[in-house]
C-alpha cells in the first residue's frame, strides 16, 4: 500500500527559507519543474522538462507569494541533451540560458558541478515544490527538503530491471515513505556541496522497493561545460 505518513516532498520537511539558494522553479503559468543554478546565466534541469517558453524563478521559497527575494528571468536558450530519449529517459538533462544574469546574493547562489561520481551511502539533499502526497494531489507552496542516501547501482537496477542506464542512479529508501514526486523533476540532488543528480523519474512516489531515479550529472560535466562555452 502507498505510504502517506507525512505530507512533505513525500516524507520530507519544510526547507529553511532560502536555505537552498541554487534551487529554481521553472514556470509556464504554473510551477512545472525545478532546476539548479550552476552559474550566473545557466540552469541545469531535466530533459523532460523542456518547454518552448520558460520563466526561471530564482530566490523562491513560497512560490505563491511574492516575498521580496525573487528574481524572474525568462529563458533565452533551452538546450536539451542531443541524445535525450523520451521513452527511456536516458540522458535526461537540459541546460537553460537566462536572458540576463542572475544577481548572486545570500538567497540566490550557484551550486558546483561534481568532481567525482556519487558514492553509495552518501547523504544528499533533494528539494522541490512537487506533490507531497504519494497518492492524490497535495502541492506545497513552500520549498520541501529531503535528506536521502545514494543507493548502490545493484539495488537500483534490482528495483527497475532493464531500465537503469549508466547515466542514472537511485537515491532514497527501499522501505518507501520518502521520495521526490511529481513537480520535483529537474530539481537538485546535492551531495557534499556538489550537484550529483537531477530529479528524473520513478515508479510512483515513495513506494516500497521503488526509489527515485536521478540523472547522473557527473557523466555530463564535459557536455555542460562545452555547451556553455559554445553558447556564451
Amino acid at each position: 500500500a502507498p505510504f502517506d505518513d507525512d505530507d512533505k516532498i513525500v516524507g520530507g520537511y519544510n526547507c529553511e527559507e532560502n536555505s537552498v539558494p541554487y534551487q529554481v522553479s521553472l514556470n509556464s503559468g504554473y510551477h512545472f519543474c525545478g532546476g539548479s543554478l550552476i552559474n550566473e546565466q545557466w540552469v541545469v534541469s531535466a530533459g523532460h522538462c523542456y518547454k518552448s517558453r520558460i520563466q526561471v524563478r530564482l530566490g523562491e521559497h513560497n512560490i505563491e507569494v511574492l516575498e521580496g527575494n525573487e528574481q524572474f528571468i525568462n529563458a533565452a536558450k533551452i538546450i536539451r541533451h542531443p541524445q535525450y530519449d523520451r521513452k527511456t529517459l536516458n540522458n535526461d538533462i537540459m541546460l537553460i540560458k537566462l536572458s540576463s544574469r542572475a544577481v548572486i546574493n545570500a538567497r540566490v547562489s550557484t551550486i558546483s558541478l561534481p568532481t567525482a561520481p556519487p558514492a553509495t551511502g552518501t547523504k544528499c539533499l533533494i528539494s522541490g515544490w512537487g506533490n507531497t502526497a504519494s497518492s492524490g494531489a497535495d502541492y506545497p507552496d513552500e520549498l520541501q527538503c529531503l535528506d536521502a542516501p545514494v543507493l548502490s547501482q545493484a539495488k537500483c537496477e534490482a528495483s527497475y530491471p532493464g531500465k537503469i542506464t549508466s547515466n542514472m542512479f537511485c537515491v532514497g529508501f527501499l522501505e518507501g515513505g520518502k521520495d521526490s514526486c511529481q513537480g520535483d523533476s529537474g530539481g537538485p540532488v546535492v551531495c557534499n556541496g556538489q550537484l550529483q543528480g537531477v530529479v528524473s523519474w520513478g515508479d510512483g512516489c515513495a513506494q516500497k522497493n521503488k526509489p527515485g531515479v536521478y540523472t547522473k550529472v557527473y557523466n555530463y560535466v564535459k557536455w555542460i561545460k562545452n555547451t556553455i562555452a559554445a553558447n556564451s
Epitope: 518547454k51 518552448s52 523519474w201
Partner: antibody
C-alpha cells in the same frame, strides 16, 4: 500559428467504425499530447482519452475501453481516433485538443490549450 | 473518478454585470483546474489554466481563483461577446472530467 485541423463530417450506420484525424501544425508534435473530447447534441463535454505523441502511451475513458483506439503518426504530425461498434448515442461532435506532455516527475497537468474545429459524426440507420 | 460540480447551470446577466461561476471537485485537485468558454457551433476555448493563470490573448476581465476543491471563474464586467457556455475541467488526473457547464444568457 499553432493549429489542429480535423477531418470532415461522417455519417455511419450502427455497428460500423469511424476514424477521425487531427493534423497538427505550428509546433513540435512530439513535445505534446493529444486528448479527444466529444459533445453529444445539446450536452456537455465528455473526455474520451489521451495519447502521448512521442511514446504513443494512451489512457482511455473506462466507458469506451475496448471500442476506442488512439494513435499518432509522427511523420505527418497527425493523431487519429477510431471508434468501433458505433451506436446512436455516439452521435456527437468529436474534438482533438493539445495538452502538455507529462513525463517522469514533472507536474502532471492535463489542461488543453488548442482545440481542433470539431468533426461531426452521425450514427443513424 | 473525480466529479466536477458546476453552479449555477445557467445565469441571466446584463452587459457590465459581474458574473461568478463556481466549480467544486469531489476530491482535492490542488491548483489543477482549467476553465473553457464555448459558443454555439464552435470548439471550446481555453480561458484560465492552473486555476488562476490567464491564457494568452484572453481579456483580463476573466479571472480564476481557488485551490483544493473549490474554484471560481469571475467575469468582472460582462461584454456582449461573453454570452456563452463555460466549463471547468479537472486537470489533475485520469480520467479527465468536466463540469456540467454554465450557460451565461442575456437578461
Amino acid at each position: 500559428q499553432v493549429q489542429l485541423v480535423q477531418s470532415g463530417a461522417e455519417v455511419k450506420k450502427p455497428g460500423a467504425s469511424v476514424k477521425v484525424s487531427c493534423k497538427a501544425s505550428g509546433y513540435t508534435f512530439t513535445d505534446y499530447a493529444i486528448s479527444w473530447v466529444r459533445q453529444a447534441p445539446g450536452q456537455g463535454l465528455e473526455w474520451m482519452g489521451w495519447i502521448s505523441a512521442s511514446t504513443a502511451d494512451t489512457n482511455y475513458a473506462q466507458k469506451l475501453q475496448g471500442r476506442v483506439t488512439m494513435t499518432t503518426d509522427t511523420s505527418t504530425s497527425t493523431a487519429y481516433m477510431e471508434l468501433r461498434s458505433l451506436r446512436s448515442d455516439d452521435t456527437a461532435v468529436y474534438y482533438c485538443a493539445r495538452g502538455d506532455e507529462v513525463v517522469g516527475k514533472m507536474t502532471y497537468y492535463y489542461g488543453m490549450d488548442v482545440w481542433g474545429q470539431g468533426t461531426t459524426v452521425t450514427v443513424s440507420s | 473518478d473525480i466529479q466536477m460540480t458546476q453552479s449555477p447551470s445557467s445565469v441571466s446577466a446584463s452587459v457590465g454585470d459581474r458574473v461568478t461561476i463556481t466549480c467544486r471537485a469531489s476530491q482535492g485537485i490542488s491548483r489543477w483546474l482549467a476553465w473553457y468558454q464555448q459558443k454555439p457551433g464552435k470548439a471550446p476555448k481555453l480561458l484560465i489554466y492552473a486555476a488562476s493563470s490567464l491564457q494568452s490573448g484572453v481579456p483580463s476581465r476573466f479571472s480564476g481563483s481557488g485551490s483544493g476543491t473549490d474554484f471560481t471563474l469571475t467575469i468582472s464586467s460582462l461584454q456582449p461577446e461573453d454570452f456563452a457556455t463555460y466549463y471547468c475541467q479537472q486537470a489533475n488526473s485520469f480520467p479527465i472530467t468536466f463540469g456540467g457547464g454554465t450557460k451565461v444568457e442575456i437578461k
